[in-house]
């Protein structure tokens, strides 16, 4: 699976998840959330060689496609698969509230 | 949507999806399939923007994230949402036989 | 140019709900709270709750006991308050207004027109 | 729940004068070093609109004739060289603690 315990520790020039941080202030203009201050959200990076962890028979076809016309613009794309929540602190007037964002974190990729 | 009514009738520069004709043996190196002789796949290309048909917050989150940090290369890709069969004939010995091909045309794309 | 966009004037008879809209432009309508505050005639401004879009987070006054549900549709970029159990005492104009953007609870930097909810036998 | 109470409930103001509109808040609306204090106008037939923001920030778009000051449960609105334009229901708002809350109006 390319997902985090695999990538992170590869040199994966494929399809891969990569660590990436964001400032909810900085890299959102988000100031509402309390904690954290930031997060290991990652993205998916990296060529879909044919047949480099293909989501649908559709992909798997595009990719045999391309392998046939390389200079084709239709090719698969790395995107998330596996998706965490965050959990959050933020504050209502005075009084701290606890949320859970969902689909924040990205835990693996694939090729679609 | 970014389906074929849509994308097929306009000249939308952001991610939207593209015609695409696939020849079995030509494009695939497949002489199995009897007929159809191709058919037309399509395939999901162009920009994604924030706001444009993100599929998960993760990708929201990350193209806000693509907006304070123009020259990241962190950012969302253009991808198939809605898929269809592809009904085929092919032969078993010289027996004709009918399967569809499930998740083999895209109708309609999104930003993941 | 931000805009806030309001359904229009509502008659309802008392015990029914009502459902008001709020279509959105111009802005990350995912990424800033709204607001629901309502203004009885010839009286002030009530907050009643609010809501995040993105996931769909609300916070409410106690005032309204529960009656007033906040939704976001975010494929239309449009915020909706519900008012259920109405009374004689829920006529009023309901607006609903964008937090500034600093805090949950803040100002609201943009309004919509405002929707008059009239409750009547 | 913090209460809002705005002195004068009316007040008329001849053209180029200076107008004065006082809040006082049940408890103090200070807190990490901000007064989390706002003033709107509310125009006849209008909706309210943001003038001031954190007890003396002017809203962007906003004239400079009107400013706002105060801090813990104490604050002001002050309008120079009032215009005719003016004219409308002034109300302070807090956001420190929950329920967020509006002054009853100064008119």
């Known amino acids: 699976a390319l997902d985090t315990n695999y990538c992170f520790s590869s040199t994966e020039k494929n399809c891969c998840v990569r660590q990436l941080y964001i400032d909810f202030r900085k890299d959102l203009g988000w100031k509402w959330i309390h904690e954290p201050k930031g997060y290991h959200a990652n993205f998916c990076l990296g060529p879909c060689p044919y047949i480099w962890s293909l989501d649908t028979q559709y992909s798997k076809v595009l990719a045999l496609y391309n392998q046939h016309n390389p200079g084709a613009s239709a090719a698969p794309c790395c995107v998330p698969q596996a998706l965490e929540p965050l959990p959050i602190v933020y504050y209502v007037g005075r009084k701290p509230k606890v949320e859970q964002l969902s689909n924040m974190i990205v835990r693996s990729c694939k090729c679609s | 949507a970014l389906d074929t009514n849509y994308c097929f009738s306009s000249t939308e520069k952001n991610c939207c999806v593209r015609q695409l004709y696939i020849d079995f043996r030509k494009d695939l190196g497949w002489k199995w399939i009897h007929e159809p002789k191709g058919y037309h796949a399509n395939f999901c290309l162009g920009p994604c923007p924030y706001i444009w048909s993100l599929d998960t917050q993760y990708s929201k989150v990350l193209a806000l994230y693509n907006q304070h940090n123009p020259g990241a290369s962190a950012a969302p890709c253009c991808v198939p949402q809605a898929l269809e069969p592809l009904p085929i004939v092919y032969y078993v010995g010289r027996k004709p036989k009918v399967e569809q091909l499930s998740n083999m045309i895209v109708r309609s794309c999104k930003c993941s | 140019e931000v805009q806030l966009v309001q359904s229009g004037a509502e008659v309802k008879k008392p015990g029914a709900s009502v459902k008001v809209s709020c279509k959105t432009s111009g802005y990350k309508f995912w990424f800033y709270w709204m607001n629901w505050v309502r203004q009885a005639p010839g009286a002030g401004l009530d907050w009643m709750g609010q809501?995040?879009?993105?996931?769909?987070?609300?916070n409410y006054n106690e005032m309204f006991e529960g009656r007033v549900t906040l939704t976001a549709d975010t494929s239309t970029s449009t915020a909706y308050m519900e008012l259920s159990s109405l009374r004689a005492g829920d006529i009023a104009v309901y607006y609903c207004a964008r937090g500034y953007g600093n805090y949950a609870l803040d100002a609201m930097d943009y309004w919509g027109q405002g929707t008059l909810v009239t409750v009547s036998s | 729940d913090i209460v809002m109470t705005q002195t004068p409930p009316s007040l008329s103001v001849s053209p180029r004068e200076t107008a004065s509109i006082s809040c006082r808040a049940s408890e103090s609306v200070d807190s990490y070093g901000n007064s989390f204090m706002h003033w709107y106008l509310q125009k006849p037939g209008q909706s309210p609109q943001l003038l001031i923001y954190?007890?003396?920030n002017l809203e962007s778009g906003v004239s400079d004739r009107f400013s706002g000051s105060g801090s813990g449960t104490d604050f002001t609105l002050r309008i120079s060289r009032v215009e005719a334009n003016d004219t409308g229901v002034y109300y302070c708002q807090q956001n420190d603690e929950d329920p967020l809350s509006f002054g009853q109006g100064t008119k």
């Open positions: 954190l007890a003396s």
């Open positions: 809501i995040f879009p993105a996931w769909g987070m609300t």
